[in-house]
Structure formats: C-alpha cells, structure tokens
C-alpha cells in the first residue's frame, strides 16, 4: 500500500546543512551558495506508531537512495546509522521500530525523538563539519531543526 | 461510536466465491484501513488483506491468488471475494478497521459471519 | 511465511499474575499488538504497540516486547479475564496471528 511521503530539507537551528559524507554518514555543516545543492533531501514516511498533539511516528529517508536513518543499540548506548534497504520494501506504512521517530513540533522547530529509545533525538554539535548523532538532549547539542518543504 | 456491520452468504458449494461486504457506520472513512480476518471453527485468527479508501490493497500471500478486496467509499463499505473456495474455507469472517492512532492496528471488529463451504 | 508462537494454554488463580509470551524471530524489531477474544464473540484490542492498553482496557493489562519475545502481562487476574489471547504483528507486506493461548482461570 502505498503511504504518504514528503520530501523535506532540514537544517538545524545554527542553520547548518545535513550533508552526505561518505555512504553511510550524515555531517552538519554550514554551506554556502555554490555548494548548496550539496545538502541532502530527506524523504518523510508518516508510519507505524502512535501520533498524539504533538508527536506523529515518521521514517526518515534520503531522497534518491536506499538508506534510511535507524537506531540502535551499540556497545551499549543508543545511536543513530544510516542502514540499507530494499527498495522494493520500503517504505512501508509498518517499518521496524528502529527506523522510527516521533517528529516533535516545537513552536517554528521540529524536533525528531527516536521511537525506539525514548528522549533520545536526532542531534548535531556545535563544531562544524561533526556527524549527525543520536543525543539525549543533554549540554550543547543541538536537537531542534528547521523543515523546508521541497517539491517531489 | 464507529460500528461495522456485515453481511452476504452463509452456504456455499466447493469451487463458488465468497462474497462479503462490510459497512462503516460514524467516523471517517478515508483516514483507515480496513481489513478482513477469519477464524475456522475452534482455531486460530488468520488476517485476509486490507484495503485503503484509495483501493490500494495488501494481501495475505497464503490468499493472495483468490482475494480480491474493494472498497465503496460513496457508500463506506468495502468488500472481500474469495473464488475457488473448498471446505478448508469455512470460518468466521470479521472485517476490522486498523486505527493510525493504535498504531494501525484492529481497534474495531465486525460482529463477524459464518460462511459454511459444503456439497 | 513468519511465524509467531504461542502456547496453548496457560492457568492461573484468581488474583495472580498470568505470563502469555508470543515468540517469533526479531519480533522485538517490530510492533506487538494483543488482542482477547470470548467464546462467541469478536476479538478485542488489549495492548497495541507492544505496550500501551486501549481506553476502556483495565490497567491490569501490560505488554512488553524485546528480543524475540512479547510478552502479555495480566496482574490480579479475575475470571472475566479467561479467554483467548493472541499476539499480532506485521511481517513486511501483512499481519501474522500467533495461534493463540487459551487462559484459564482457576477455581
């Protein structure tokens, strides 16, 4: 069954752009007019969970490519990758716990906590140029984005 | 309160289709999914497929060659074919609706019928 | 075809806790959802999401799911709790039932 998808850009509140830094990881980092096409579209899968006021169950995929973000346990502490999958699968309106974060909207920023580990967000640091990870809101990470629509 | 009301035939002869249709009475009728499930005589609950209002479909891939799901949204009903049908279809059938909000799951059942298959 | 396991009876005395477990390979990768079902009558939602109960549902319903395991949980149980119980889950393009626990209340 087909399921609903938007296609997003995402910055963080710093305004730094999500880039793709080799195959498998995301970089926060601030781009400029040239290189701008170089941030990576997310594609937003509305799916399995339970949506409430303000927290909807969304998949996050990179538009164009069979990676999805996930997370998992490893050497003990919630962390975030980005995994491969099969097109013909995914996305699927029923994705594998792992691959889900309830999108949080918080006045003009959105925050994205993973389903699987509770007060755990997608995170990026105040350094440039540092891989995106998943954080339990704690010092000066970054976990509130801003979402900009892009046109399928 | 969201009710679902069932009907169609109750007795068939080996080799005839199963029809059954399924009501929707109160609540939306596009933000669902809405399943059928079935239960042979003292066993187990076996999940037939599910449909959206749009007529897309998934189905179980033990069925899938004989199940045809459709779905009316001018009338908030859907319904389910089954064709070749022997004795090991006899069961209960329930039509369900599965909730975003329980996580797209069944959060509402039919009252269910009986369909005998018998020569 | 994914399978999920159940088994097929479990008793209890009244006022005790009764374990139900649904096992399935990386089950606990996925949502577990439970429901009860009564001699004679449609099914019921008791736990979906592996955890969280349906209003109306008493709190003395829980779920856990991890590793290969869901487990349904029912704490002082009362005899209108005997039933049926199935576990449910997703398994990639559609549902999968365990076979289902027929839960028996003691006395």
């Known amino acids: 069954v087909p399921i609903r998808q938007l296609h997003y850009r995402l910055r963080d509140e710093q305004q730094k752009s999500l880039v793709l830094s080799d195959p498998y990881e995301l970089k926060a980092l601030h781009l400029n007019g040239q290189n701008i096409n170089q941030q990576v579209i997310f594609s937003m899968s509305f799916v399995q969970g339970e949506p409430s006021n303000d927290k909807i169950p969304v998949a996050l995929g990179l538009k164009g490519k069979n990676l999805y973000l996930s997370c998992v346990m490893k050497d003990g502490t919630p962390t975030l990758q980005l995994e491969s999958v099969d097109p013909k699968q995914y996305p699927k309106k029923k994705m594998e716990k792992r691959f889900v974060f309830n999108k949080i909207e918080v006045k003009s920023k959105v925050e994205f906590e993973s389903a699987e580990f509770p007060n755990w967000y997608i995170s990026t640091s105040q350094a440039e140029h540092k891989p995106v990870f998943l954080g339990n809101n704690s010092g000066q990470d970054i976990i509130d984005f801003t979402m900009e629509s892009v046109s399928s | 309160q969201v009710q679902l009301q069932q009907w169609g035939a109750g007795l068939l002869k080996p080799s005839e289709t199963l029809s059954l249709t399924c009501a929707v009475y109160?609540?939306?009728?596009?933000?669902?999914?809405w399943s059928w499930i079935r239960q042979p005589p003292g066993k187990g609950l076996e999940w037939i497929g599910e449909?959206?209002?749009?007529?897309?479909?998934n189905y179980n891939p033990s069925l899938k060659s004989r199940v045809t799901i459709s779905v009316d949204t001018s009338r908030n009903q859907f319904s389910l074919s089954l064709s070749s049908v022997t004795a090991a279809d006899t069961a209960v059938y329930y039509c369900?609706?599965?909730?975003?909000?329980?996580?797209?799951?069944?959060?509402?059942w039919g009252q269910g019928t009986l369909v005998t298959v018998s020569s | 075809q994914s399978v999920l396991t159940q088994p097929p009876s479990v008793s209890v005395s009244p006022g005790q806790t009764a374990s139900i477990t649904c096992s399935g390979d990386?089950?606990?990768?996925?949502?577990a959802f439970w429901y009860q079902q009564k001699p004679g009558q449609s099914p019921v939602l008791v736990i979906y999401?592996?955890?969280k109960r349906p209003s109306g549902i008493p709190e003395r319903f829980s779920g856990s799911n991890s590793g290969n395991t869901a487990t349904l949980t029912i704490s002082g149980t009362q005899a209108l709790d005997e039933a049926d119980y199935y576990c449910?889950?997703?398994?990639?393009?559609?549902?999968?039932f365990g076979g289902g626990t027929k839960l028996t209340v003691l006395g």
């Open positions: 369900a609706r599965a909730s975003p909000s329980s996580g797209w799951t069944l959060d509402y």
């Open positions: 109160g609540g939306s009728f596009s933000d669902y999914y």
């Open positions: 449909i959206d209002h749009s007529g897309s479909t």
């Open positions: 990386k089950l606990g990768d996925k949502f």
């Open positions: 999401l592996d955890n």
């Open positions: 449910e889950a997703w398994a990639d393009t559609y549902e999968v």
